[in-house]
């Protein structure tokens, strides 16, 4: 806290300009009017204040707006945004995408801070849903943003917003999140033709059910092994050797290198060894010839 002292003669600030960088902290406190600062916030970011001087400016704004800053001030906070606590930000009502972009720009290239997370939360809650423009903006600044949301939060993403999602935006998503996103993607891309559809849906396939994988296997999609390895184990297990061969196309040879990893390992255990041998890859661990396969899950469902 800067000690309250009278402003020296001739130093009262008439406007927010570069001369203020030469003011001590106590001079800024005494000589800069908070209302003047608020009306000329757009100038602050262009002036190379020290980190400590920015503390004083924040303190002045806090005194002027104890209930939270108006959006006209928030939009021009610039580096001052980095001084805001999540508690400060919870008082704000941010409705403009331009304001959101301006504040995200300040933090660009850095990890998502608690301040940014709170800001995004306030903004999205204010909008009621994650619309396409917002999602576009957020994933541009934070590719992992989508995967930071809970399945419940993801359920508010409209299918139209899925067009904004890039493959790298889903890199850190877990199966529960992809379970929510996949049906939305399927709906969003439903009018595309086979090969274009596969390119778009590929990143979301970690949430695909067995029947959709079976359908894809009939379309010559040549799924790569990296995508196959991200599929839900429970969705892969019921696929036949022939279906997996069709699904992977020329990439089927990659199964050998992955035979000890899920879902390939679990899938191998469910296949007849005879069928696996038809692939000519030397995959081992299938059900030996002459053994009967009982589907216990089916039995339980019937009883």
């Amino acid at each position: 806290e800067v000690e309250k002292t009278a402003c020296p003669s001739g130093k009262k600030a008439r406007e927010i300009d570069e001369s203020l960088i030469f003011y001590k902290k106590w001079e800024l406190e005494a000589c800069v009017d908070a209302a003047l600062l608020a009306t000329q916030m757009d100038r602050v970011n262009a002036i190379p204040f020290t980190y400590e001087q920015l503390d004083v400016l924040k303190h002045k704004l806090d005194e002027l707006y104890p209930q939270g800053y108006p959006e006209s001030v928030i939009q021009h906070l610039g580096y001052l945004f980095l001084k805001m606590s999540p508690e400060d930000i919870r008082k704000w009502n941010v409705t403009s995408l331009e304001t959101l972009k301006a504040l995200l720009e300040v933090n660009k290239g850095h990890e998502m801070s608690p301040q940014v997370a709170t800001l995004i939360d306030r903004f999205v809650k204010g909008r009621g849903q994650l619309d396409k423009d917002t999602l576009d903006t957020l994933t541009a600044f934070y590719p992992g943003y989508l995967c930071s949301l809970s399945p419940e939060e993801l359920s508010s993403v409209p299918p139209s917003s899925i067009w904004a999602v890039r493959p790298q935006d889903l890199d850190t998503c877990d199966p529960r999140q992809l379970d929510v996103l996949y049906p939305k993607a399927r709906l969003a891309f439903q009018n595309m033709n086979g090969s274009e559809y596969f390119v778009k849906i590929q990143s979301f396939l970690g949430g695909a059910p067995t029947e959709d994988l079976k359908a894809l296997s009939q379309q010559n999609v040549s799924m790569d092994l990296a995508t196959f390895m991200k599929l839900r184990t429970d969705a892969v297990l019921p696929l036949t050797v022939a279906e997996v061969q069709k699904l992977l196309g020329p990439h089927v040879e990659g199964l050998k290198a992955e035979e000890r990893h899920r879902p390939v390992r679990d899938w191998i255990l469910r296949q007849r060894q005879d069928d696996l041998d038809t692939l000519g890859l030397g995959l081992q661990g299938g059900i030996p010839n002459g053994y009967l396969v009982l589907d216990l899950s089916m039995q339980e469902a019937l009883s």
């Epitope: 190379p48 980190y51 980095l82």
Partner: nanobody, 116 residues
Framework: QVQLVQSGGGLVHPGGSLRLSCAAS????????MRWYRQAPGKERDLVAL???????YYEDSVKGRFTITRDNPSNKVFLQMNSLKPEDTAVYYC???????????WGQGTQVTVS
């Protein structure tokens, strides 16, 4: 660790010139706003000159037209060229590296400039 090492101070007659140098190790100075401060005996430390990361410079009124702050990013150094020196320029001069993104800032060890 980060170090700012200053050199170039000394005793000079009024009207003379000196060039202060500030060499950094452990940080890339091109990412920082660089400042020169001075502190005369019994006085507060005052900002004299500043150069931003994009090369824009600012000067305190009493040194405008006499002092020039420059940076040489390849050598990771900042300089303060002081011409037409006056007795009132006598002080210990400090270089400082700071970024608005962080409360951490770095200081040189200080160098005495005496104009007499």
């Amino acid at each position: 660790q980060v170090q700012l090492v200053q050199s170039g101070g000394g005793l000079v007659h009024p009207g003379g010139s000196l060039r202060l140098s500030c060499a950094a190790s452990g940080i890339d100075l091109s990412l920082y706003r660089m400042r020169w401060y001075r502190q005369a005996p019994g006085k507060e430390r005052d900002l004299v000159a500043l150069i931003t990361d994009d090369g824009t410079s600012y000067y305190e009124d009493s040194v405008k037209g006499r002092f020039t702050i420059t940076r040489d990013n390849p050598s990771n150094k900042v300089f303060l060229q002081m011409n037409s020196l006056k007795p009132e320029d006598t002080a210990v001069y400090y270089c400082n590296a700071e970024t608005p993104l962080s409360p951490v800032n770095y200081w040189g060890q200080g160098t005495q400039v005496t104009v007499s």
